[in-house]
Amino acid sequence: IVLRPSRVHNSEENTMRALTLKDILNGTFSYKTFFPNWISGQEYLHQSADNNIVLYNIETGQSYTILSNRTMKSVNASNYGLSPDRQFVYLESDYSKLWRYSYTATYYIYDLSNGEFVRGNELPRPIQYLCWSPVGSKLAYVYQNNIYLKQRPGDPPFQITFNGRENKIFNGIPDWVYEEEMLATKYALWWSPNGKFLAYAEFNDTDIPVIAYSYYGDEQYPRTINIPYPKAGAKNPVVRIFIIDTTYPAYVGPQEVPVPAMIASSDYYFSWLTWVTDERVCLQWLKRVQNVSVLSICDFREDWQTWDCPKTQEHIEESRTGWAGGFFVSTPVFSYDAISYYKIFSDKDGYKHIHYIKDTVENAIQITSGKWEAINIFRVTQDSLFYSSNEFEEYPGRRNIYRISIGSYPPSKKCVTCHLRKERCQYYTASFSDYAKYYALVCYGPGIPISTLHDGRTDQEIKILEENKELENALKNIQLPKEEIKKLEVDEITLWYKMILPPQFDRSKKYPLLIQVYGGPCSQSVRSVFAVNWISYLASKEGMVIALVDGRGTAFQGDKLLYAVYRKLGVYEVEDQITAVRKFIEMGFIDEKRIAIWGWSYGGYVSSLALASGTGLFKCGIAVAPVSSWEYYASVYTERFMGLPTKDDNLEHYKNSTVMARAEYFRNVDYLLIHGTADDNVHFQNSAQIAKALVNAQVDFQAMWYSDQNHGLSGLSTNHLYTHMTHFLKQCFSLSD
């Protein structure tokens, strides 16, 4: 199945050129998406190409500038946020990245009524997080791990918390592990729908062991970076949730929300908070052994000024075959009655589907069903539920948007996107305005991405927001590789794969094969999306075949495949890559003396284990920032899939699944090991231990470190990395430079 859109080829073949590595490193063929910044049912803001902030009204068809690029430039603003009452804009500058989501910045408040910056009671700097209330123009912000509240931008701040302390107590922002592995946000505070209450999390990291690594910088002595980072089995952060009345914050102060008794009896996590109304809130909790999750609906008691979470409003979600949820436990989407909700969880056949919960989880009404999975609930209105799934034509790597009419009985289902631009668009996400009056569809491929605006009642396309015309023109004279997505059936397991083939691919010839692997639990690599990246170049210019395979442990194909790796990481993921390679060899066009594998992060772990599998299939391979032992990785992630590294739990497999245990098996492969020394996520320790084991086994290997670089190896390191890996692969495959 060729997924690239067909193009009329110029009759003069010599006008077409292959991709170059420079094209990739320069981002020559990157695409744009358009996500409206919705401010009402029919209005959105967008930053124009010349950096003006423009308001668009879909119904009047009018647009106008609310903030000029001159004002933005006056404070070097790189981001903005309009207050819901439309009186003020915060301007964000001095962006300084911390971890994956977190950053600090300087904030200025601009008064739109008088065209001036608010003077007096200016915000401190740098701020860790800042947001407007959902109504009006109250401000909540986090500074030096404490939360502050302003009733108006020019008012003095009210300090809500006082115990915040660097690396010890975090208020309103997550610590490292909650940011990366649980919340996936830079914030841990949530306004109630009308801004009456502010809920926040407090994380106590006092007893967490610290990871320390050198940051070399330019000084005579390196700095030491210290991060409270719980590795598997270590002491975890202690979390508490508080809610404060923002109208009278000093009246009773923050009130703690009680933890369900069945959760509080042992180590636990807080997983998410969802406001239902101004006086009803829903909290989700998770046992440290992550197969039991409790959703708790709590109500404000006016008389006591406290939050009450009755046992009758506790809903338990338990997995008997794996962990609770997919990557995370799903969050509820409440209906208009403010008590019932829609939620995605496994049905009796082991497929993740939308369920409607009115009283108990046991009495849940299943809304979607089939041997496919519902992936995200975008919006629930009075009469419609919008969600995405991979149902259409049974391709797990696609995403289409569906509408279920919940106002009528029986509910009817309509695929909004399936037939819109069928060849070009098979992988969508959506962004909805208030009450789903309008929505934007963002198509990621397999053709060139396109963003469109639609009417929320009729689904009619109103206009194209971004169609990447320049990219389309730039690609006209490029020989792109061909891509196909197919499946292998092996021992009752379906292995979906994507194969990227050289432009003049000829089945009767033999090609070197590169396997690109990630393979982590609940991940998906085989997706119908557009990309012009390093592997596109390797196929286009260097004549390699590249394959990506989704094996056991990967997502959106049911629990049998997903939970197959439970408590056994590093076994089936590797087996399935090897099985796929054997099948590819059988296809007849792979040169079996020139097969390589590479991966990053979890993929670096899998590629290392595949190289050390002793099969003799791989000539060479690359591991970038690999995990080498699950004892070195974060508790929240690792224990979800592996349990605890204790004798009475799963220590044996922790020990058996290390890369170091297989050091001897690297003797007959060419191995390139790469890691950033300032990797806060997968610590350099992982590669240091692989290198030590290889040296101790007297096994030759190649290595590259990137000083002061984190898990992303960004900036100039990226260019160096891909150039270095290209040389390594070309040498391995005996391709001339």
Partner: nanobody
Framework: QVQLQESGGGLVQAGGSLRLSCAAS????????MGWYRQAPGTRREWVAT???????NYADSVKARFTISRDNAKNTVYLQMNSLKPEDTAVYYC?????????WGQGTQVTVSS
């Protein structure tokens, strides 16, 4: 320049009422979110009231329960009904979109409340 014309201002005694009008002409559609703003002598311009695209209204605390913003789509006009006026309401009143069109304001209409 913004194509909005304010009118209806004048001199009124404390406790009295006025109704301000804002007529939109040319390319401005009154169905956009609209706002009233005011500037008293020696102070910065401040927001008074907003009517959103779907007809919801918001008011500054200082005018709540005294002022009412409304619109007439057919006449392409926005109104501000001001009751129980106080001397501190004395200002030049402007109408604009909400948020306002950047750097673009009309002449306004003067409201003076005597005690």
């Amino acid at each position: 320049q913004v194509q909005l014309q304010e009118s209806g201002g004048g001199l009124v005694q404390a406790g009295g009422s006025l109704r301000l009008s804002c007529a939109a002409s040319g390319s401005i559609d009154i169905r956009n979110a609209m706002g009233w703003y005011r500037q008293a002598p020696g102070t910065r311009r401040e927001w008074v009231a907003t009517i959103t695209t779907d007809g919801r209204t918001n008011y500054a605390d200082s005018v709540k329960a005294r002022f009412t913003i409304s619109r007439d789509n057919a006449k392409n006009t926005v109104y501000l009904q001001m009751n129980s006026l106080k001397p501190e309401d004395t200002a030049v009143y402007y109408c604009n979109l909400a948020p306002p069109i950047f750097g673009s304001w009309g002449q306004g209409t003067q409201v003076t409340v005597s005690s």
